[in-house]
Interface confidence: medium
């Protein structure tokens, strides 16, 4: 028991007229000692679930349930995950800009279309906001040093292989 509210630790409250440090009641917290009241803990319900439970010194933290994502500071609201052809920004789901795509649901980003010409290939099928460009086969003329593009497993990016 302290004789001054200034000496109270987080997790307690203290009234000036009766300067005794008292523990915060259940479901309340105080991150700074010496305050006249403890704060009510946040409850994560509905589209929210607990990320961190409340303690006597820290408020609870919420996150969104599966299929939803947080918006606003301290996850003040939940919004449904974005569709293919969109990306999540601070303002919510936005359509991919021209020249980019996202082929997945969720909170991923729109990625730039593959640049077929960097690999010496032509565009076989133009890209959309949901699908990447499809590149044609490489133009292979076996000169002394020829570069063949090899598409890596599962994705449209390109590795280069030197054939000497």
């Amino acid at each position: 028991v302290q004789n001054s509210c200034d000496n109270c630790q987080p997790g307690t409250f203290c009234r000036k007229y009766n300067p005794v440090c008292k523990s915060c009641p259940p479901s309340t917290f105080s991150s700074i000692g010496g305050q006249p009241n403890c704060n009510i803990c946040r409850v994560c319900a509905g589209y929210f679930r607990f990320k961190k439970f409340c303690s006597s010194t820290h408020n609870a933290e919420c996150e969104c349930i599966e299929g939803f994502h947080c918006l606003g500071p301290q996850c003040t609201r939940c919004e449904k995950d974005c569709r293919p052809g969109q990306e999540l920004t601070k303002q919510g789901c936005k359509t991919c800009s021209l020249g980019t795509f996202n082929d997945q649901n969720g909170t991923g980003v729109c990625r730039p279309w593959t640049n077929c010409s960097l690999d010496g290939r032509s565009v076989l099928k133009t890209g959309t906001t949901e699908k990447d460009v499809v590149c044609g086969p490489p133009v292979v003329s076996f000169s002394p040093s020829t570069t063949i593009s090899v598409t890596p497993e599962g994705g449209p990016g390109g590795h280069s292989l030197q054939v000497l």
């Epitope: 920004t89 598409t151 994705g155 990016g157």
Partner: antibody, heavy 120, light 110 residues
Amino acid sequence: EIQLQESGPGLVRPSQSLSLACSVTGYTITSAYDWSWIRKFPGNKMEWMGYIAYIGFTNSNPSLKSRISITRDTSKNQFFLQLKSVTTEDTATYYCARWSSYIPRYFDFWGPGTMVTVSS
Amino acid sequence: QAVLTQPNSVSTSLGSTVKLSCTITSGNIEDNFVHWYQHYEGRSPTTMIHNDDKRPDGVPDRFSGSIDSSSNSAFLTINNVEIEDEAIYFCHSYVSSINIFGGGTKLTVL
């Protein structure tokens, strides 16, 4: 614990190619995330160079597009940087790092960095 | 292309509060999340704040992040500054399919 470690020559001649490897332990690079290269120039300017995604997709900084190639060896859990036609302006500390294209989109694990000097 | 601008250096005294700024040009702070990294020379950078104001586990609550729409800026505030806070602090954002970094602020603790 996830760890990344860069390796490669500390000195490269102008007009040659710079080649670096990043070895990842504690996480499989084909599971998730985008595996990035970042460099820090003398004077502290930091530049994102590009990444190879877990599915093999690559993306790079438009300022480097014509010179950069990022590849990987999934059997060794490594990814690589090749930067062609280097000049003294490419002298920097090179870092590999893990980035998520999903929220939250930040670099959560970094290698210690490797200093590369371009000089004749 | 968007640019993140930070002051080159900031000095502060032990035990005080310091606020580091990161201003976005050719972009909107309300559209893009900002992240902050602490970097000691010769070591790996570590994340101090992500998504404007989120603190990763293990980062002291002396560190906090905020944004101000009117100045189009993000801020990293360090309360009760300690000697070990002396480092370079970088801000970072993902804008138009590109990761961009600020020039870094060297924080000196007097």
